[in-house]
Interface confidence: low
């Protein structure tokens, strides 16, 4: 049965030319993490493999780090990364959880994170 | 057309050595993982060799193991294999092939249509 | 012998459904993705499932596949005589650090 819940950075925004760290945790499992994937939509971003490491897709090399821990830093933001991200956790031997991040890039110097919630 | 093209093979005596090219054509060569596979005669898929996008990160089959060299060169588009104190047990048709999605183990989703090497006296 | 265990033949008749079983371990199909690929005689493999359920563009939705805890399956539904080829399934093994591939299932249209 799957325990786990995934706690993430929920909606947030960020100006436009800056950077945001996209972050989920899962917790309540003891199942063992073996991947976690970065999409936005169906477009992989990044994975982080727990045998072979972090893994960028050739697309976003430029403008995506790996880290903080399995979160991702998203730099140089644009309008046009505004939308939803997913961080998905392969786990063994509970299987896939999801968690989804909602981020907003402004045009103007006002940003604020929203709250933290949690998808179970 | 993304397409891999195997050569190289051939008829080669015990001990003896070869070298299996695999060019690449319709795709950034070097934003993938690449693999080799093979299939001795009448058998199942055999897994063979990965290496990573620019050649730091290479994985072998135990049975190849300090016997076989992956390497590619990004900059020809091609992927290699040296084969060094070849045996019997490594005639087959050796593939190419390329990691789906750029993203390693997802699954390999381009084949070549694959070389043979016979290991014979 | 192969890390992953299927069985050597199934059959059906044009239009059944069929069910190709993989076995694995943890270290395999437990802990990472299964790919399946199918192989008609005198061919190349090509991809049917990667990411355990996921069709490259170009295979027919009649192949769909699942996985639970250390096995897979592949599912073939309406049956059809082009289908009558050796179908594998593969998956990268941390322990051996390379991918493992089953010993390959036969599938005869009858």
């Known amino acids: 049965m799957m325990t786990g819940t995934i706690e993430t950075t929920g909606n947030i925004s960020a100006e436009k030319g800056g950077s945001i760290i996209l972050q989920c945790h899962l917790s309540s499992t003891t199942a063992q993490v073996t991947q976690v994937n970065w999409e936005q939509q169906d477009q992989l971003l990044a994975i982080c493999n727990a045998d072979l490491g972090w893994h960028i897709s050739p697309s976003f090399k430029d403008r995506v780090a790996p880290g903080p821990g399995l979160g991702l830093t998203l730099q140089s933001l644009t309008v046009n990364d505004t939308g939803e991200y997913f961080c998905i956790y392969h786990t063994y031997p509970d299987g896939t959880y999801t968690g989804r991040i909602f981020l907003e890039v402004l045009e103007s110097s006002v940003a604020e994170h929203g709250a933290r919630f949690q998808i179970p | 057309e993304v397409q891999l093209l195997e050569s190289g093979g051939g008829l080669v005596q015990p001990g003896g050595s070869l070298r299996l090219s695999c060019a690449a054509s319709?795709?950034?060569?070097?934003?993938?993982?690449m693999n080799w596979v093979r299939q001795a005669p009448g058998k199942g898929l055999e897994y063979v060799a990965s290496?990573?996008?620019?050649?730091?990160?290479?994985y072998y089959a135990d049975s190849v193991k300090g016997r076989f060299t992956i390497s590619r060169d990004n900059s020809k588009n091609t992927l290699y294999l040296q084969m060094n104190s070849l045996r019997a047990e490594d005639t087959a048709v050796y593939y190419c092939?390329?990691?789906?999605?750029?993203?390693?183990?997802?699954?390999?989703?381009?084949w070549g249509q694959g070389t043979t090497v016979t290991v014979s006296s | 012998q192969s890390v992953l265990t299927q069985p050597p033949s199934a059959s059906g008749t044009p239009g059944q459904r069929v069910t190709i079983s993989c076995s694995g371990g943890?270290?395999?199909?437990?802990?990472?993705?299964v790919s399946w690929y199918q192989q008609l005689p005198g061919t190349a493999p090509k991809l049917l499932i990667y990411n355990e359920i996921k069709r490259p563009s170009g295979v027919p939705d009649r192949f769909s596949a699942s996985k639970s805890g250390t096995s897979a399956s592949l599912a073939i539904s309406g049956l059809q005589s082009e289908d009558e080829a050796d179908y594998y399934c593969?998956?990268?093994?941390?322990?051996?650090?390379?991918?493992?591939f089953g010993g390959g299932t036969k599938l005869t249209v009858l």
């Open positions: 593969a998956s990268w093994d941390g322990s051996l650090r390379g991918w493992v």
């Open positions: 092939a390329k990691d789906q999605n750029w993203n390693f183990y997802y699954g390999m989703d381009v």
């Open positions: 943890s270290s395999n199909i437990g802990n990472n993705f």
């Open positions: 319709g795709f950034t060569f070097s934003d993938y993982y």
């Open positions: 290496i990573n996008w620019n050649g730091g990160t290479t």
